[in-house]
């Protein structure tokens, strides 16, 4: 999917108001200093592609954060404000529900939230380089 | 807890250069932006720049540029600032400043250091 | 660059007194709209952040509203640690911009 003409400005509010305190919930009791961000976005369509690969693709070591409250309202909200994403949304989800494994909090989870973050980080404020 | 610890107060003449430095503690230095902002004796705040930790990237406030140099260095968590061809009108408290968890705020800045530019 | 235009400058009120600072942007900046509190010699605290979203450990006597261009922030009730100079800031796109400050001071 191409994030190009999603309503940043509504996804970001989004982001603030619920998603972000979510992520929070999700990570309390880890220690700020335990995870350094090694996935980045240059621009907001490329941090949500990014997003959306860490949110709903497993991986290694962590396959259920497609279920967390943070992931279903992520979903809703590209699904409000980025045109076209719930069709290309409608196979996917039907293969994830035949595969649904019950919720494990690993450190590997963890660590790919603890990275999310920080890809809704750059979301929120890119820094473009100055010409 | 997160700390941003800034060093001591400068006296400069006119022209001078000055680096202030601003060591962080208590969370992944890489992982946030710093932002630098200044304060002149009553006034307000003024934005100079942003330094993104990991990736040496800038951004300067048109005012300062060509005059403002920021770098971090990533093995000791220090975030730096230099003003070159100082002036009397550089006198002012400077602060360096984390982003936020969220990306959309400052939540910790330095203690602040105070530049006099003085003949 | 974006001008961030807050008002009043200076504002005398009492305790217990209900106040409200707003703060106007050249353009629109949606809610990308930051509030702080400064008290002499100390460095700024941030109160909220999107333009409503209260900080963590902010009472919630403070309240921001507002998107686009007009933004105000909001005390219910005055308490006597409350008197401070308050800034908006814009977090919309670099280069960040401040207001220009609203010091509130006891009547």
């Known amino acids: 999917y191409d994030f190009t003409n999603c309503d940043f400005e509504k996804i970001k509010a989004a982001y603030l108001s619920t998603i972000s305190k979510d992520l929070i919930t999700y990570m309390s009791g880890t220690k700020s200093t335990e995870f350094n961000n090694t996935v980045s976005c240059s621009n907001r369509p490329h941090c949500l592609t990014e997003i959306q690969s860490l949110t709903f693709n497993p991986t290694a070591g962590c396959a259920s954060l497609a279920k967390e409250m943070f992931a279903m309202k992520t979903k809703a909200a590209l699904a409000i404000w980025c045109p076209g994403y719930s069709e290309t949304q409608i196979n996917a989800t039907q293969a994830m529900k035949k595969r649904r494994k019950r919720k494990v909090t690993t450190n590997k989870c963890l660590e790919q939230v603890s990275q999310l973050q920080g890809l809704w980080r750059r979301f929120n404020r890119p820094l473009l380089k100055q010409q | 807890q997160v700390q941003l610890q800034q060093s001591g107060a400068e006296v400069k003449k006119p022209g001078a250069s000055v680096k202030v430095s601003c060591k962080a503690s208590?969370?992944?230095?890489?992982?946030?932006?710093i932002e630098w902002v200044r304060q002149a004796p009553g006034q307000g705040l003024e934005w100079i720049g942003v330094?993104?930790?990991?990736?040496?990237?800038?951004y300067y406030s048109e005012k300062f540029q060509g005059r403002v140099t920021l770098t971090a260095d990533k093995s000791t968590s220090t975030a730096y600032m230099e003003l070159s061809s100082l002036r009397s009108e550089d006198s002012a408290v400077y602060f360096c400043a984390k982003e936020s968890l969220t990306g959309s705020s400052y939540d910790y800045w330095g203690q602040g250091t105070t530049l006099t530019v003085s003949s | 660059d974006i001008q961030m235009t807050q008002s009043p400058s200076s504002l005398s009120a009492s305790v217990g007194d209900r106040v409200t600072i707003t703060c106007r942007a050249s353009?629109?900046?949606?809610?990308?709209l930051v509030w702080y509190q400064q008290k002499p010699g100390k460095a700024p605290q941030l109160l909220v952040y999107?333009?409503?979203n209260l900080a963590d450990g902010v009472p919630s006597r403070f309240s921001g509203s507002g998107s686009g261009t007009q933004f105000s922030l909001t005390i219910s009730s005055l308490q006597p640690e409350d008197f401070a100079t308050y800034y908006c800031?814009?977090?919309?796109?670099?280069?960040?911009?401040f207001g220009t400050g609203t010091k509130l001071e006891i009547k």
């Open positions: 208590g969370y992944a230095f890489t992982n946030y932006l």
């Open positions: 999107g333009a409503r």
């Open positions: 353009e629109n900046i949606y809610s990308n």
């Open positions: 800031q814009h977090f919309y796109e670099t280069p960040l911009t």
């Open positions: 330094i993104n930790p990991e990736s040496g990237d800038t």
